[in-house]
Interface confidence: low
C-alpha cells in the first residue's frame, strides 16, 4: 500500500539550466527506490543509484518529487523543487502626482524569476529614514509623505530584492522637484462650434489626484491634428481648462489631447485620453443620421502617442500656426498644405 506523506516535503530551489541531484533522504546509494514527480513515475535512466539526476533544468521540472522503497512503496523522502532564476537589478522609479502631499515609488524586475521574491525599500531624506507606506492595491508600490516642502535635501530610495537563488539591489537619488509629474487632465471633451466651420471648443478638468491647484497651479499643453495627417499642432496654455481651436479644417475629424505640468517644477504629464470631434459643416454631408452623429460628437479613445517632452516646450517650435506636411505624409516633396488640398487629401 502507498502511504501518504507524513512529513512536510523538503523545499529546494534550483537555477534554471543547471543540473541537480536529489538524494532519496537518508537511503543508501544502492537502495532500490522509485521516484515520482507529481504522482507520475520517472524513468529509471534518470537515477544514479537511489539518487535522481535532473540535467538542464527547465521550468517544467518544478514539482513535488517523491522517492519510495520499490518493494514496500514506503515513502522515504519528498522534495518540492522550484526552478527559477536569481533576480536581476530591479527597475525603480519615483513620482509625485499628488504634489505637495508626497510621492510614490514603484519597482519591478526586468525579467521574471519564477520563484518568490522579497523586496525591501528604504527611503532616506538626507540621513533620515522615511516611512514608505505599502500601497493597499499595488504590491510593488509604496508611498512617502513630505514632512517639509521645498527641501534642498536629496531623497535616496534604495531597493533590494532577494530570493532563494540570489540577491540584487539598486538605488536612485533625486530632488523633491524633479519627480513632480501630474496625472493627465481628465474628461477631455471637444465640441464643434455652431456656424463656425474652423472652430472646436476643447474643455478638460484638472487631474483629480492633484490636491491643491490653487496653491500649485497647473499649466496645460494641447495638441491636435486631423485624423488624415500625422503632424500635430501644439498650444501651450498658462491657465484655464478650456481652449478654442480656431484653425481647424471644416468637415475633418480631429483628435485632441491635453497634458498638464506644475507651473514651475517637474515634468509634463502623459497625454490625456484622446477626444475626437469634427468641426461644424454647412452643407449636408449625405450621411445617415447615425453616421453624422458619430462624426460630430465627441468620443474618446486611448492614445499611444508619447507625452510632451522638454523639446516640445521650445518656444521656437510652438510659434508656427501653419500645417506643415512632410514627404512621409504625402509621398512627395515637403510643402505647405492648403485647406483646398485638405479637402482632396483622403484617408490613407
Amino acid at each position: 500500500q502507498r502511504h501518504s506523506p507524513q512529513e512536510a516535503p523538503h523545499v529546494q530551489y534550483e537555477r534554471l539550466g543547471s543540473d541537480v541531484t536529489l538524494p532519496c533522504g537518508t537511503a543508501n546509494w544502492d537502495a532500490a527506490v522509485t521516484w515520482r514527480v507529481n504522482g507520475t513515475d520517472l524513468a529509471p535512466d534518470l537515477l544514479n543509484g537511489s539518487q535522481l539526476v535532473l540535467r538542464g533544468l527547465e521550468l517544467g521540472h518544478s514539482g513535488l518529487y517523491a522517492c519510495f522503497h520499490r518493494d514496500s512503496w514506503h515513502l522515504r523522502h519528498q522534495v518540492l523543487l522550484h526552478v527559477g532564476l536569481p533576480p536581476r537589478e530591479p527597475v525603480l522609479s519615483c513620482r509625485s502626482n499628488t504634489y505637495p502631499k508626497g510621492f510614490y515609488c514603484s519597482w519591478h524586475l526586468p525579467t521574471p524569476t519564477y520563484i518568490p521574491n522579497t523586496f525591501n525599500v528604504t527611503v532616506l531624506h538626507g540621513s533620515k529614514i522615511m516611512v514608505c507606506e505599502k500601497d493597499p492595491a499595488l504590491k510593488n508600490r509604496c508611498h512617502i509623505r513630505y514632512m517639509h516642502l521645498f527641501s534642498t535635501i536629496k531623497y535616496k530610495v534604495s531597493i533590494s530584492v532577494s530570493n532563494a537563488l540570489g540577491h540584487n539591489a539598486t538605488a536612485i537619488t533625486f530632488d523633491e522637484f524633479t519627480i513632480v509629474k501630474p496625472d493627465p487632465p481628465e474628461n477631455v471633451v471637444a465640441r464643434p462650434v455652431p456656424s463656425n466651420p474652423r472652430r472646436l471648443e476643447v474643455t478638460w478638468q484638472i487631474p483629480s489626484t492633484w490636491p491643491d491647484p490653487e496653491s500649485f497651479p497647473l499649466k496645460f499643453f494641447l495638441r491636435y491634428r486631423p485624423l488624415i495627417l500625422d503632424q500635430w499642432q501644439h498650444v501651450e496654455l498658462s491657465d484655464g481648462t478650456a481652449h478654442t481651436i480656431t484653425d481647424a479644417y471644416a468637415g475633418k475629424e480631429y483628435i485632441i489631447q491635453v497634458a498638464a505640468k506644475d507651473n514651475e517644477i517637474g515634468t509634463w504629464s502623459d497625454w490625456s485620453v484622446a477626444a475626437h470631434a469634427t468641426p461644424w459643416t454647412e452643407e449636408p454631408r449625405h450621411l445617415t443620421t447615425e453616421a453624422q452623429a458619430a462624426e460630430t460628437t465627441t468620443s474618446t479613445t486611448s492614445s499611444l502617442a508619447p507625452p510632451p517632452t522638454t523639446k516640445i516646450c521650445d518656444p521656437g517650435e510652438l510659434g508656427s500656426e501653419q500645417k506643415l506636411i512632410s514627404e512621409e505624409d504625402l509621398g512627395g516633396e515637403q510643402k505647405l498644405i492648403s485647406e483646398e488640398d485638405l479637402h482632396h487629401h483622403h484617408h490613407h
Epitope: P100, G126, S127, R145, Y146, M147, H148, L149
Partner: antibody, heavy 120, light 108 residues
Framework: QVQLVESGGDVVQPGRSLRLSCAAS????????MHWVRQPPGKGLEWVTI????????YYADSVKGRFTISRDNSKNTVFLQMNSLRTEDTGFYYC?????????????WGQGTLVTVSS | DIQMTQSPSSLSASVGDRVTITCRAS??????LNWYQQKPGKAPKLLIY???SLQSGVPSRFSGSGSGTDFTLTISSLQPEDFATYYC??????????FGQGTRLEIK
C-alpha cells in the same frame, strides 16, 4: 520679518488641560514643519513634537505621547499644542519653532516662548 | 534615540579668551549637528549648522568643527555679549530631535 508668537500659557493644576497657540507671520507657513520645544525653569531644551507642513504627520517625544496633541490651521498660519493630563514635570517655557527646509535640518525660526506652570 | 553630551556643563572665562565647548553623540551623526546660543529670558538663536557652517549674521569669532561623534564649538575671542548658554542639537536621526544638556558660559 519673521515672527512666531506663542500664547495660552497659564498656571494649571496637575491633571488639567491647556491649549497653546503659535501664530506665524513673515514666511510661508504652509511650507514648513512646525515644532514645539520646551524648557523647564533653569534647565535645558527638550524637543516635544513636530507636525508636517500639511498636518498629515505628527511625532511626539515619549514623555508626552498620548497626552499632547499637535495640530495646525494653515489658513490661519497657526499651530496648536493641546496638552491634557498635565504633570508637574510639564512645567516650563514652551517655544514653537519652524524647521528649516534646507540641509541639514535645524530650527530656523523661534517664538519668544510662553510659560506653562503645573502646580497644585 | 541618540544622546548628546556636552562638556563642560559650565565654564568661566574672561573677555578676549578663546573658549571651546565640546559635544559628543552616542552614535555617529555625520555632520548633522547644530549649535544654538540662548540668553536668559530669550529664545535660542542658531549659530552653527551642519557642524561647521556659520549662520548668516553670526560673528566670525564663532566656529564649529567635528564629524561623526565628536564636535566642537569655538569662540576665538570672547566678547561681553557672548556670555550665555550654548546647546548642541543633532538632526541625524529624527524624530526625536535631541539636544545636549547645555553649557553655561559665565564671566570670570
Amino acid at each position: 520679518q519673521v515672527q512666531l508668537v506663542e500664547s495660552g500659557g497659564d498656571v494649571v493644576q496637575p491633571g488639567r488641560s491647556l491649549r497653546l497657540s503659535c501664530a506665524a507671520s513673515g514666511f510661508t507657513f504652509s511650507y514648513y514643519g512646525m515644532h514645539w520645544v520646551r524648557q523647564p525653569p533653569g534647565k535645558g531644551l527638550e524637543w516635544v513634537t513636530i507636525i508636517s507642513f500639511d498636518g498629515s504627520q505628527k511625532y511626539y517625544a515619549d514623555s508626552v505621547k498620548g497626552r499632547f496633541t499637535i495640530s495646525r490651521d494653515n489658513s490661519k498660519n497657526t499651530v496648536f499644542l493641546q496638552m491634557n493630563s498635565l504633570r508637574t514635570e510639564d512645567t516650563g517655557f514652551y517655544y514653537c519653532a519652524a524647521q528649516s527646509s534646507t540641509w541639514p535640518e535645524y530650527f530656523q525660526y523661534w517664538g519668544q516662548g510662553t510659560l506653562v506652570t503645573v502646580s497644585s | 534615540d541618540i544622546q548628546m553630551t556636552q562638556s563642560p556643563s559650565s565654564l568661566s572665562a574672561s573677555v578676549g579668551d578663546r573658549v571651546t565647548i565640546t559635544c559628543r553623540a552616542s552614535q555617529s551623526i555625520s555632520s548633522y549637528l547644530n549649535w544654538y546660543q540662548q540668553k536668559p529670558g530669550k529664545a535660542p538663536k542658531l549659530l552653527i549648522y551642519a557642524a561647521s557652517s556659520l549662520q548668516s549674521g553670526v560673528p566670525s569669532r564663532f566656529s564649529g568643527s567635528g564629524s561623526g561623534t565628536d564636535f566642537t564649538l569655538t569662540i576665538s575671542s570672547l566678547q561681553p555679549e557672548d556670555f550665555a548658554t550654548y546647546y548642541c542639537q543633532q538632526s541625524y536621526s529624527t524624530p526625536p530631535i535631541t539636544f545636549g544638556q547645555g553649557t553655561r558660559l559665565e564671566i570670570k
